[in-house]
Interface confidence: low
């Protein structure tokens, strides 16, 4: 159980106040984290509160400003990047968001040696991506879908690719589907460790069907946004990987890296690229039917100036019970011999664990094991491997950092974080300096987040980087809800849940219940993290009980739970939410006549299906930007879990799992449907089809659209959205305004 320390004493009660919706919308109780921008083993950069860029040396204790806020302001810079030789800084301004990760910006290069901006051969604008080489001060950038290289910031650019075309050919940047569903980055180019080579992806979207939607703006005629977007079963992008020698880029030009034959025999994806040395690179490929992944280690052939990927260096990862990997296929972390590596994949018991691969995957040595999961490998040094897992005390929603000493035999394991601030901190991530000389720990909760700096050898805490003192003081007179994390055992399934309870919770009373659901494959909602958000307000001020439940399909509890939803989305996720609600009713403090469910995106899909389940459990519910049919969603994501929408594959379940098929069942619930019209991710089409089906079935419902808003419903729309949903729930639960 995680109970927030109660600060409510009778004498103080009248000075304490509940959270308000305004607190949430204003971000009054948001927290800060501190991630050092490491530039060596013992130095990092950080942007100070007054916007100076400051270099800190941990060993000397000294700090100095390398770039003043005046210089930053002179070009309205919102971001920066120091060249590895420390001679130049790029300054980023005119940020213009595109999709989830991508944006364009204007870049200025500032010369630290003479304190002036580099003039002559200035960069074009707007640039889609720009980065320094890992050594020196070469620049690679993407402009109008083509890649350019500069040996020095003031030099004229060398154009690497020439075939880039908007919405057709993407060089060095991903197209929509690769950005969102495969790479999860705005870039698709990778420098080799010493900057000798530059690898990049080319995505050909020529044959991909286009999603088109109106952007209303304020002109007389709306604009049409066109995005090549492969929906389930549609034609996919064609990807090719090239590598160019950046020292003599014109000599042989870009060389294509061969695709493994077993992958190339049918539709496939490129999933990631990892440089091992300057002359060895590791590529990961995935069949379109995403249960086979191939990791291919390729070597530079000096004689032919080509990249050779011998079959003996191909490692196959295959799932027989689901898809390959978790959400993504994990990436390798290479050891110092530059051929063996550490990687997380399922062990024979169906738990994701770290394995050491020296020659073949079949001969992999399992490094971690147990009925828990290794989640991320942070760093491998000569003698240590740092990773995170949810092993400690068997709470899947925790994250602790561990160190395995790989230099000694037998290797020993130590939990670095388990007992540091046990009540406050149970969910960590980490950031390591070069050679793991030092590292920062960032604790996200369940208490107020705190970031600390540690010695990489001894694990000693050196200093607190951010402890959110102001937030702690601001919360002193706030009646926060209580939170508990527990589990239900139902039919051999463990359902972990988080319950958020009103401050003066009394088990003998009856409370309205709101289920907040996401429920997507490989997600996790029940986490030991701090948050003061909308549901905190609903519990604190409006007296609701809120519950989050991780059912089948969710992550970090083994493959049996994870892969239970394979080829069957929309069935077990919904069943498990319903099962949990029935268990909550049995606890005796829930008002059975006042139960609601809400979710966003995948959660909107699950909440819609739960409302239309015909159980009579839910009085009302909200779906924000829901998927309504898997035929409308992106190929890469959808097919991973559902296969193809073809007769000889899984078309039947595609058809059976739509929200529209259940239109009749919405008759006895109050349904609020919400969507942004400019949603590039879950297209407005999804809600349009739900609305049409409800109208055709003559079922009453409520709806709200947000003009020109995307999947995030940001800015003023956020305030409107949460205000609107609050009114809807209060009305549903007969709570006075």
């Amino acid at each position: 159980i995680v109970l927030r320390p109660s600060r409510v004493h009778n004498s103080e009660e009248n000075t304490m106040r509940a959270l308000t919706l305004k607190d949430i919308l204003n971000g009054t109780f948001s927290y800060k984290t501190f991630f050092p921008n490491w530039i060596s083993g013992q130095e990092y950069l950080h942007q100070s509160a007054d916007n100076n860029i400051v270099l800190y040396n941990i060993e000397t204790g000294q700090s100095y400003t390398i770039l003043s806020n005046r210089t930053m302001k002179s070009v309205n810079a919102s971001n920066y990047g120091l060249s590895p030789d420390r001679q130049f800084v790029y300054l980023e301004s005119d940020y213009s968001k595109l999709w989830r990760y991508s944006y364009t910006a204007t870049y200025y290069i500032y010369d630290l040696s003479n304190g002036e901006f580099v003039r002559g051969n200035e960069l074009p604008r707007p640039i889609q991506y720009l980065c320094w080489s890992p050594v020196g001060s070469k620049l690679a950038y993407v402009y109008q879908n083509n890649i350019y290289l500069k040996q020095r910031p003031g030099d004229p650019p060398f154009q690497i690719t020439f075939n880039g075309r908007e919405n057709k050919i993407f060089n060095g940047i991903p197209d929509w589907v690769y950005e969102e569903e495969m790479l999860a980055t705005k870039y698709a180019l990778w420098w080799s460790p010493n900057g000798k080579f530059l690898a990049y992806a080319e995505f050909n979207d020529t044959d991909i069907p286009v999603i088109a939607y109106s952007y209303y703006g304020d002109e007389q005629y709306p604009r049409t946004i066109n995005i090549p977007y492969p929906k389930a079963g549609a034609k996919n992008p064609v990807v090719r990987i090239f590598i160019i020698d950046t020292t003599y880029p014109a000599y042989v030009g870009p060389q294509e890296v061969p695709v493994p034959a077993m992958i190339a025999s049918s539709d496939y994806y490129f999933s990631w690229l990892t440089w091992v040395t300057d002359e060895r690179v590791c590529l990961q490929w995935l069949k379109r039917v995403q249960n086979v992944s191939v990791l291919s280690i390729c070597d530079f052939r000096e004689d032919w100036q080509t990249w050779d990927c011998p079959k003996t260096q191909e490692h196959i990862e295959e799932s027989r019970t689901g898809w390959a990997g978790g959400f993504f296929v994990s990436t390798p972390v290479f050891s110092y011999d530059a051929i063996s590596y550490y990687k997380i994949f399922s062990d024979k018991d169906g738990y994701k664990h770290i394995h050491y691969i020296k020659d073949t995957v079949e001969n992999a040595i399992q490094i971690t094991s147990g009925k828990w999961e290794a989640i991320n490998i942070f760093r491998v040094t000569q003698d240590s491997l740092f990773y995170s897992s949810n092993e400690f005390e068997e709470y899947p929603g925790r994250r602790n950092i561990y160190r395995i000493s790989i230099g000694s035999y037998p290797p020993s394991k130590k939990c670095v974080t388990c007992h540091l601030r046990k009540e406050r901190c149970q969910y960590y991530t980490a950031s390591f300096s070069d050679y793991a000389k030092y590292y920062a720990l960032v604790c996200y909760g369940p208490g107020i987040p705190i970031s600390t700096l540690h010695d990489g050898r001894t694990d000693q805490e050196i200093k607190i980087l951010e402890e959110n003192k102001e937030l702690e003081n601001a919360l002193k007179n706030i009646q926060l809800p209580k939170e508990e994390i527990k589990k239900l055992e139902v039919d051999e399934i463990t359902l972990w849940y988080k319950m958020i309870l009103p401050p003066q919770f009394d088990r003998s009373k009856k409370y309205p219940l709101l289920i907040q659901v996401y429920g997507g494959p490989c997600s996790q909602s029940v986490r030991s993290v701090f948050a003061v958000n909308w549901i905190s307000y609903l519990a604190s001020k409006e007296g609701m009980v809120i519950a989050l439940v991780d059912g089948r399909g969710t992550a970090f509890q083994g493959d049996k739970l994870l892969y239970a939803v394979y080829r069957k989305l929309g069935v077990y996720e919904v069943e498990d939410q319903i099962t949990a609600v029935r268990k909550f009713i049995e606890m005796g403090f829930i008002d059975e006549k006042r139960i609601a469910i809400w979710g966003w995106s995948y959660g909107g899909y699950v909440s819609s299906l739960a409302l239309a389940s015909g159980t009579g459990l839910f009085k009302c519910g909200i779906a924000v930007a829901p998927v309504s049919s898997w035929e409308y969603y992106a190929s890469v994501y959808t097919e991973r879990f559902m296969g193809l929408p073809t007769k000889d594959d899984n078309l039947e379940h595609y058809k059976n799992s739509t929200v529209m098929a259940r239109a009749e069942y919405f008759r006895n619930v109050d349904y609020l449907l919400i969507h942004g019209t400019a949603d590039d991710n879950v297209h407005f089409q999804n809600s349009a089809q739900i609305a049409k089906a409800l109208v055709n079935a003559q079922v009453d419902f409520q709806a709200m659209w947000y003009s020109d808003q995307n999947h995030g419903l940001s800015g003023l729309s956020t305030n409107h959205l949460y205000t609107h949903m609050t009114h809807f729930l209060k009305q549903c639960f007969s709570l006075s305004d």
Epitope: Q255, E256, P258, V259, A261, A264, D308, C309, P310
Partner: nanobody, 123 residues
Framework: QVQLQESGGGLVEAEGSLRLSCAAS????????LAWFRQAPGKSRELVAA???????YYADSVKGRFTISRDNARNTVYLQTNSLKPEDTAVYYC?????????????????WGQGTQVTVSS
């Protein structure tokens, strides 16, 4: 740039064999991926077999186990050994080359082509 010239085609009975050769000009032959395509009358050109610069091979399902592609970088030549020939193997066989990966089945990915050599298999 690379120029390609095929030879070795002809008339052969079913179950017979032929060895097709493709001679290439150009100093950087070893860096090219090479392939054999074929085009039967009224049909589109299809990839039969390909070999990468590193020697990795690819075969169309219809010829697996019967045809073998190989290359001799010293002689600047790529070969296609065709055994157990069937009447449906009758076509003009083309040699093709490209830089980078061999595993592209679409003819538009192969910029360099020979003139072709006729293979006729009689029943």
């Amino acid at each position: 740039q690379v120029q390609l010239q095929e030879s070795g085609g002809g008339l052969v009975e079913a179950e017979g064999s032929l060895r097709l050769s493709c001679a290439a000009s150009g100093r950087t032959f070893g860096t090219y991926a090479l392939a054999w395509f074929r085009q039967a009358p009224g049909k589109s050109r299809e990839l039969v077999a390909a070999i990468s610069s590193g020697g990795s091979t690819y075969y169309a399902d219809s010829v697996k186990g019967r045809f073998t592609i190989s290359r001799d970088n010293a002689r600047n030549t790529v070969y296609l050994q065709t055994n157990s020939l069937k009447p449906e193997d009758t076509a003009v066989y083309y040699c093709a080359a490209k830089t980078g990966s061999a595993y592209y089945t679409n003819r538009i990915d192969w910029p360099y082509w020979g003139q072709g050599t006729q293979v006729t298999v009689s029943s």
